[in-house]
């Protein structure tokens, strides 16, 4: 069995989580991919997913989550913009491959969002960014409802951080329309 590891990202409110999930492009280029949150004792919950089949470099936005799947590179980019403290939790990138269970990409992400002025408009990119605009044309894809039953029976992965996931529902999934995110200059 693959050992599940976690990568801790500590960011401030208003910043952007920017994760690159690599995959074998020959196998998974056009497969549908998703961003999920994992709460203790629950099955992973899909927050956003790419279209099926996944479109090359075409941004999909659900609330404050933006997915971009780069087929040519074997890379799924996940961004959560304007982070809030309640976004803290455990996340993962997965590839849907029905009828098989989803294939997990990358390390799981332990996101810790703290209050306080970030100093940058919304990035964890060390201020090297000089242009950052959310694309005006984004689509929202319909995500499959199933999740892997096996994931539930796994022991929760050990974390280097003692961070609890908030009990309150994250608003990211309660969005029915595409939300326009303010442009950062």
């Amino acid at each position: 069995a693959t050992k599940l590891t976690e990568e801790k990202y500590e960011l401030k409110e208003g910043q952007t989580l920017d994760v690159k999930c690599d995959y074998t492009l020959e196998k998974f280029a056009s497969s549908q991919k998703a961003w999920q949150i994992i709460r203790d004792g629950e099955m992973p919950k899909t927050l956003a997913c790419t279209e099926r089949p996944s479109k090359n470099s075409h941004p999909v936005q659900v609330g404050r989550i933006i997915l971009e799947d780069y087929h040519d590179h074997g890379l799924l980019r996940v961004r959560m913009v304007n982070l809030q403290v309640e976004d803290s939790g455990l996340y993962q990138c997965v590839i849907y491959q029905p009828p098989k269970e989803p294939h997990m990409l990358f390390d799981r992400i332990r996101l810790v969002v703290t209050k306080g002025f970030s100093g940058t408009p919304g990035s964890n990119e060390n201020s090297t960014q000089n242009v950052y605009k959310i694309p005006p044309t984004t689509t929202k894809a319909l995500c499959p409802l199933y999740t892997s039953p096996r994931t539930v029976t796994q022991a929760p992965p050990k974390s280097t951080a003692d961070v609890s996931t908030p009990d309150s529902e994250i608003n990211l999934t309660n969005v029915t329309d595409i939300i326009r995110v303010p442009v950062f200059n």
Epitope: E7, K20, D22, D72, L75, F106, N124, T128, Y132
Partner: antibody, heavy 116, light 107 residues
């Protein structure tokens, strides 16, 4: 077959300017991030700048920020690097590369020499 | 800025032998690590991405491993065409940074 062909390199005096260009073919240019990576003679690789497909995101290494400008013309499948206020330490082979984070395809490079 | 450190600077290996190259990051880069090969007078070529995924057309003798801060590129049985300089690169955060390179030379 992916092809990236750089041009515009040459000898320039400190404080001068050069504009590098890259002609891309063999892939969907408008769907790809593009970057410039440089290599000083006998040295290692250094990332210079990256630009998203629609230029909505652009990143530079600190050493060139404010002096270099990366741009692209998707209609012409071309990538550019405008280099101003050049310094001796900018002397290098400049590679046009496909990708914004890691680099799948590389051109053969164009040599920029900054010397008086 | 994430600093990438490669070791050794030079590795002398006989053809057919195994070569193990190391790359260390000053802070965690998760699995966002790539390896490149560069031969004299040529542009670099992507070998490995995602720390362990072989790029298209790369022979199976090349393998990558590691996560976080410690990474390894292994060439299981060196062929004559494998003698070159190898670079690691992190792409977790901008600025993107490369290691200083490891030269694999014929013993």
């Amino acid at each position: 077959e992916v092809q990236l062909v750089e041009s515009g390199g040459g000898l320039v005096q400190p404080g001068g300017s050069l504009r590098l260009s890259c002609a891309a073919s063999g892939f969907t240019f408008s769907s790809n991030w593009m970057s410039w990576v440089r290599q000083a003679p006998g040295k290692g690789l250094d990332w210079v700048a990256s630009i998203k497909q629609d230029a909505s995101e652009i990143y530079y290494v600190d050493a060139v920020k404010g002096r270099f400008t990366i741009s692209r013309d998707n209609a012409k499948n071309s990538l550019h690097l405008q280099m101003n206020s050049l310094r001796a330490e900018d002397t290098a082979v400049y590679y046009c590369v496909r990708g914004g984070w890691r680099f799948e395809s590389w051109g053969q490079g164009t040599l920029v020499t900054v010397s008086s | 800025e994430i600093v990438m450190t490669q070791s050794p600077a030079t590795l002398s290996v006989s053809p057919g032998e195994r070569a193990t190259l190391s790359c260390r990051a000053s802070q965690s880069v998760s699995s966002n690590l790539a390896w490149y090969q560069q031969k004299p007078g040529q542009a670099p070529r992507l070998l490995i991405y995602g720390a362990s995924i072989r790029a298209t057309g790369i022979p199976a003798r090349f393998s990558g491993s590691g996560s976080g801060t410690e990474f390894t590129l292994t060439i299981s049985s060196l062929q004559s065409e494998d003698f070159a300089v190898y670079y690691c690169q992190q792409y977790k955060n901008f600025p993107l940074t490369f290691g200083g390179g490891t030269k694999v030379e014929i013993k």
